[in-house]
């Protein structure tokens, strides 16, 4: 249904080949996407409330797309600068993470359940309680299937987990 | 050809270190999802940690097993990980493999075998 | 954790036969955001390390013999060996990724008669 004004391939941006995405304006994709979609031609790529759109073969749709599935993109993405500037990006750090079963989490409410119901005591990062909850507006196709809000993926609590100890140069706070 | 070469295994009394590492080559080492998982003699297969990408600030996620006794970090100029092991318990012995989780794929290293033994 | 479940724990077949591996997970594999199950079939012959067969629970990793085939969607999978070699003699593990920790089944045994 490319073309389709309502279908899963209905752009509201498309990014020309030409003119690939600024560095800021990735980092901003890769904390919004939800989903994508491969259409014949291009991808799009559902983030909050809209969605963007580039050519199959553009180096910066595969990398977008490779993020989503490695589960780097979207709700697990902490972002160097905006999620975590108690961090210090200069080196890698050496942390240490609480570890659970964090399940593919449907509603917000679900998920403020499951974070008072853990036994490891999971906190939230610095800045991600944010408007990264919103679903889509109804009337825009997603390939989400049914039952899955926009906040539920792999490991789409695992930005809930955040270190129980401080270690090496990066000292994390959290905030219970 | 993605190749994974673990090394640093050997033979280690309770309670005390050592510390893996793993050369990677052949694929974007800087984009993948790195992990360590072992396996016991004549045991199953259990994984032991993971280090996220640069873009999520190398965070880091252990198994219960393992967790405050050992450390994982990447250093993305050289193409290598690295697993320092402390407190080693007799229940760590284990042939201790590093994956590279591409969308291409997760691959697998040969192997490095730890054993603790007094 | 996610639980994932194989069965069975060993058979033997005969060579030519054909083989089905069952692994069933404690949640749903497949991610909305992608349409893909994350799910993967191992193959490990003794004193080797695991090599990988399929990932996204049906796509053939390079390399693999075209007997191999993995499928399934949501919590239940299936590998299937068509055609059984005597080279096909290993433990078979399913892996899920979909979350952390990973989790992987307790094997199966394929023997030949």
């Known amino acids: 249904n490319e073309g389709s004004v309502t279908g899963s391939c209905y752009c509201g941006k498309r990014i020309s080949s030409d003119s690939p995405p600024s560095v800021q304006f990735m980092n901003r994709l890769r904390k919004h996407l939800r989903a994508y979609h491969r259409c014949l031609y291009y991808t799009r790529f559902q983030l909050l409330s809209w969605s963007v759109c580039g050519g199959n073969k553009d180096p910066w749709v595969q990398e977008l797309m490779s993020c989503l599935d490695l589960k780097e993109c979207g709700h697990a993405y902490s972002g160097i600068v905006a999620h975590q500037k108690h961090l210090l990006p200069t080196s890698p750090p050496i942390s240490q993470a609480s570890e659970g079963a964090s399940s593919d989490i449907h509603t917000p409410a679900q998920m403020l359940l499951s974070t008072l119901q853990s036994t490891q005591r999971p906190t939230l990062p610095v800045g991600s309680l944010s408007s990264d909850k919103e679903l889509t507006r109804p009337n825009e196709t997603t390939i989400h299937t049914a039952g899955h809000s926009l906040a539920a993926g792999p490991e789409a609590g695992e930005n809930q987990k955040q270190p129980e100890k401080n270690a090496g140069p990066t000292a994390r706070t959290s905030a219970t | 050809e993605v190749q994974l070469v673990e090394s640093g295994g050997g033979l280690v009394k309770p309670g005390g270190s050592l510390r893996l590492s793993c050369a990677a080559s052949?694929?974007?080492?800087?984009?993948?999802?790195m992990n360590w998982v072992r396996q016991a003699p004549g045991k199953g297969l259990e994984w032991v940690a993971r280090?996220?990408?640069?873009?999520?600030?190398?965070?880091?996620f252990y198994a219960d097993s393992v967790k405050g006794r050992f450390t994982f970090s990447r250093d993305d100029s050289k193409n290598t990980l690295y697993l320092q092991m402390n407190s080693l318990k007799t229940e760590d012995t284990a042939v201790y493999y590093c994956?590279?989780?591409?969308?291409?794929?997760?691959?697998w290293g040969q192997g490095t075998t730890v054993t603790v033994s007094s | 954790d996610i639980v994932m479940t194989q069965s069975p724990d060993s058979l033997a077949v005969s060579a030519g036969e054909t083989v089905t591996i069952n692994c069933k997970s404690s949640?749903?594999?497949?991610?909305?955001?992608?349409?893909?199950?994350?799910l993967a079939w191992y193959q490990q012959k003794p004193g080797q390390s695991p090599k990988l067969l399929i990932y996204?629970?049906?796509t053939r990793q390079s390399g693999v013999p075209d007997r191999f085939s993995g499928s399934g969607s949501g919590t239940d999978f299936t590998l299937t060996i068509s055609s059984v070699q005597a080279e096909d003699v290993a433990v078979y593990y399913c892996?899920?990724?979909?979350?952390?920790?990973?989790?992987f089944g307790g094997g199966t045994k394929v023997e030949i008669k």
């Open positions: 949640q749903s594999l497949l991610y909305s955001g992608n349409q893909k199950n994350y």
């Open positions: 994956t590279a989780w591409t969308t291409e794929g997760i691959y």
């Open positions: 892996q899920q990724y979909y979350d952390t920790p990973w989790t």
């Open positions: 280090i996220r990408t640069k873009p999520n600030n190398y965070a880091t």
């Open positions: 052949g694929f974007t080492f800087s984009n993948a999802v």
């Open positions: 996204w629970a049906s």
